[in-house]
Amino acid sequence: MEDEKPKVNPKLYMCVCEGLSCGNEDHCEGQQCFSSLSINDGFHVYQKGCFQVYEQGKMTCKTPPSPGQAVECCQGDWCNRNITAQLPTKGKSFPGTQNFHLE
């Protein structure tokens, strides 16, 4: 629903970081946390991290899952720790608002 969309919020959250952009760090700080899954040549590549600036993740977080990619976003310290992005299963619809979690 429209009113469930996260508002621009300068607060920074600690996020779990796992993936190519994390370097040697296992956490990052940003205005949103995410958990993503992409299919690379048929192999599942899971990543977690943060968007430093809210606008950075705005469009990504609104994008519904596709057969090759899914992103779930949240706001709250370590909120992406127990989130695992999942691809849509056949016959289910995934409106963009369903993959945003507020904590």
Partner: antibody, heavy 118, light 106 residues
């Protein structure tokens, strides 16, 4: 127990075709991506192709793109590799494999030998 | 494509030895790396996934470490059944295997 059994290998002339099959059992086949990996005699391993759960998305190594086609029949718990325009360098043992989402290539079949020679 | 290199290409060791095999990626692959063992006439067998996670049923003498471009497979105390070829495999992008490391009896 997960079982993957490949068949269909054999001797074929350059330019010829062959269709490999991999019969799966011991797991819910339609829930898993499937893969073909090959190994030339005395050589290393090479990923060949992947297919998603419903067969709607397929992926190929550049070396086989346009010549090989991966497909699956979930009602028969079988994945296939149709190989056309075969070359001597396609000679290899072809393995079928499965992943779990978190564990790539967790299970392999015993392989089937394809020999391309005149 | 991401290139994978392994060193050494072969090594001789005795039962009970600690064995270390290195795998290097040509670019950052984070922890998207598996280790496989292959014995003559057999299919490869998964030992380690996601760089350092031990596959179910694999003895704890096998361990993996590394992130980014440098990875290591360690066998803490080599057993007679461990003489084989070991391959690393990356699935970060354009899946590729390393050329293999043959572990032979000294």
């Amino acid at each position: 127990e997960v079982q993957l059994v490949e068949s269909g290998g054999g001797l074929v002339q350059p330019g010829g075709s062959l269709r490999l099959s991999c019969a799966a059992s011991g797991f819910t086949f339609s829930n898993y991506y499937m893969y073909w990996i090959r190994q030339a005699p005395g050589k290393g391993l090479e990923w060949v192709s992947s297919i998603n759960t419903d067969g709607g998305s397929t992926y190929y190594a550049d070396s086989v793109k346009g010549r090989f086609t991966i497909s699956r029949d979930n009602s028969k718990n079988t994945v296939y590799l149709q190989m056309n325009s075969l070359r001597a360098e396609d000679t290899a043992v072809y393995y079928c494999a499965k992943s779990t989402p978190n564990i790539p290539l967790a299970y392999w079949g015993q392989g089937t030998l394809v020999t391309v020679s005149s | 494509d991401i290139q994978m290199t392994q060193s050494p290409s072969s090594l001789s060791a005795s039962v009970g030895d600690r064995v270390t095999i290195s795998c290097k990626a040509s670019q950052n692959i984070y922890k998207y790396l598996n280790w496989f063992q292959q014995k003559p006439g057999e299919a490869p067998k998964l030992l380690i996934y996601y760089s350092n996670s031990l596959q179910t049923g694999i003895p704890s003498r096998f361990s993996g470490s590394g992130s980014g471009t440098d990875f290591t497979l360690t066998i803490s105390s080599l057993q007679p059944e461990d003489f084989a070829i070991y391959f690393c495999f990356q699935y970060s992008s354009g899946p590729t295997f390393g050329p293999g490391t043959k572990v032979e009896i000294k």
